[in-house]
Interface confidence: low
Amino acid sequence: EEELQVIQPEKSVSVAAGDSATLNCTVTSLIPVGPIQWFRGAGPGRELIYHQKEGHFPRVTSVSESTKRNNMDFSIHISNITPADAGTYYCVKFRKGSPDVEVKSGAGTELSVRAKPSAPVVSGPAVRATAEHTVSFTCESHGFSPRDITLKWFKNGNELSDFQTNVDPAGKSVSYSIRSTARVVLTRRDVHSQVICEVAHVTLQGDPLRGTANLSEAIRVPPFLEVTQQSMRADNQVNVTCQVTKFYPQRLQLTWLENGNVSRTEMASALPENKDGTYNWTSWLLVNVSAHRDDVKLTCQVEHDGQPAVNKSFSVKVSAHPKEQGSNTAAENTGTNERNHHHHHH
């Protein structure tokens, strides 16, 4: 009498999520009498997938008519595969009894499920940073299988190299997640820049998924300040201009101080954008020279995006000149054209 063999011809089967899988199994003998059962996994914790005689298995059907008298084909068909179905499936022959006794198991067929990664989500830093600082962007994508995946970072089309990537978990799993953190050095020209995280996977047929983040949400470009005086007007009024240039974002408050006292406060709004995405703003202050006996110290104070104020001062010389000779009024810029370096980077 020939010894019973349980043959599972495929060592592994790979199926796309949503498709059906066929797991093949044949036996070489009709003896002993008893049912075939399919399990996922081995050992005491194995999961019953299909029982030839009893139970309800809505997604599993027998490929051949397993109830036919001389049937030796016990292959099964599993529909609507999900990543949770991944695992090793065993076709197991039992001898009829009370209870049935396991006789022999097939070698097992590993079912792997090809699942697409989710659209990459790129998140940037919680607080803005200024040019020359380095900020981190994180890209995450989930739910893919198999584990092999490629992730690349780009800034404005140029590939980045300063990043660290990990695929989780390290061991076998029904599906995987990828997380990558890239470090990007900001420049003043980055208001319109983008970082792109690109994920390539076997399920994407060469068409990678991309996630993007705008550097405009991560960058702060502090303003340049310049205070100048226009020529003295006939009515003894001096027009002093504070030019605030090349800043981003638009959130900015400007305060004029005369000899240390607040004269006027303005908020920037609805400004036109420069080509590089930054903004400019000009504010004027009229000073009546005849109302002052001594020199007037004017300060243009700018608070940008919640950062410490930047000051630029300017002296209007009135004491050395008769009021009627207003055109000879001298001006002195006591500020500097240097950028204010007190912006805090978190």
Epitope: S136, T165, S180
Partner: antibody
Framework: QVHLQQPGAELVKPGASVKLSCKAS????????INWVKQRPGQGLEWIGN????????NYNEKFKTKATLTVDKSSNTVYMQFSSLTSEDSAVYYC???????????????????WGQGTLVTVSA | DIQMTQTTSSLSASLGDRVTISCRAS??????LNWYQQKPDGTVKLLIY???TLHSGVPSRFSGSGSGTDYSLTISNLEQEDIATYFC?????????FGGGTKLEIK
């Protein structure tokens, strides 16, 4: 090239603390984990913990959780390990080593130590 | 924690010999096994990572193999400069753990 610089020796009294340093150079300090490894005289190697300079994430071996504290000074590319309540059992050579494995923020793949410091000999003695 | 066992704590061999040092893990470490060399002066160097990948600058006479729980390091043609203690380390699961070491001496 990659270099991890450690002081040669520290002599400390029982019950005191010691702060060991590991100064890194020759690579992007922020994106590699730095590990600390203990070796008692004539014994094997024991992993204490590691720190990721960029995010200051840390992992500790349970055995050393109350004993070791890892910190980083990014401005000087230096990692520190503070060892507290010292006893004779803490007399050992302490190495720092750079991780080469691809893992980030608590998610792990295989990990190996590609570059090692020369080690600091800590002697605990009254 | 995963226990790493190097059953041979010391080994004597002659120059030119082929030497094999073994290491066993208490559970499957999926090839995340690394080998280090510690010279008598205490200097530690990585030799091999991920079971069989040679670290840059390591001579080709060193090789590694194994899978599951059993791994080995082989030196095909022993040289004087190979006199050292060799440690295995698993990089599969925190905390990272090392074998007790195998001290290689010249006969």
């Amino acid at each position: 090239q990659v270099h991890l610089q450690q002081p040669g020796a520290e002599l400390v009294k029982p019950g005191a603390s010691v702060k060991l340093s590991c100064k890194a150079s020759g690579y992007n300090f922020n994106i590699y984990w730095i590990n600390w490894v203990k070796q008692r005289p004539g014994q094997g190697l024991e992993w204490i913990g590691n720190i990721y300079p960029s995010s200051i994430s840390t992992n500790y071996n349970e055995k050393f959780k109350t004993k070791a504290t890892l910190t980083v000074d990014k401005s000087s590319n230096t990692v520190y390990m503070q060892f507290s309540s010292l006893t004779s059992e803490d007399s050992a050579v302490y190495y720092c080593a750079r991780s080469e494995g691809t893992y980030y923020g608590g998610r792990y793949e295989g990990d190996w130590f590609g570059y090692w410091g020369q080690g600091t000999l800590v002697t605990v003695s009254a | 924690d995963i226990q790493m066992t190097q059953t041979t704590s010391s080994l004597s061999a002659s120059l030119g010999d082929r030497v094999t040092i073994s290491c066993r893990a208490s559970q499957d470490i999926r090839n995340y096994l690394n080998w280090y060399q510690q010279k008598p002066d205490g200097t530690v160097k990585l030799l091999i990572y991920f079971t069989s990948t040679l670290h840059s600058g390591v001579p080709s006479r060193f090789s590694g193999s194994g899978s599951g729980t059993d791994y080995s390091l082989t030196i095909s043609n022993l040289e004087q400069e190979d006199i050292a203690t060799y440690f295995c380390q698993q990089g599969n699961t925190l905390p990272w753990t090392f074998g007790g070491g195998t001290k290689l001496e010249i006969k």
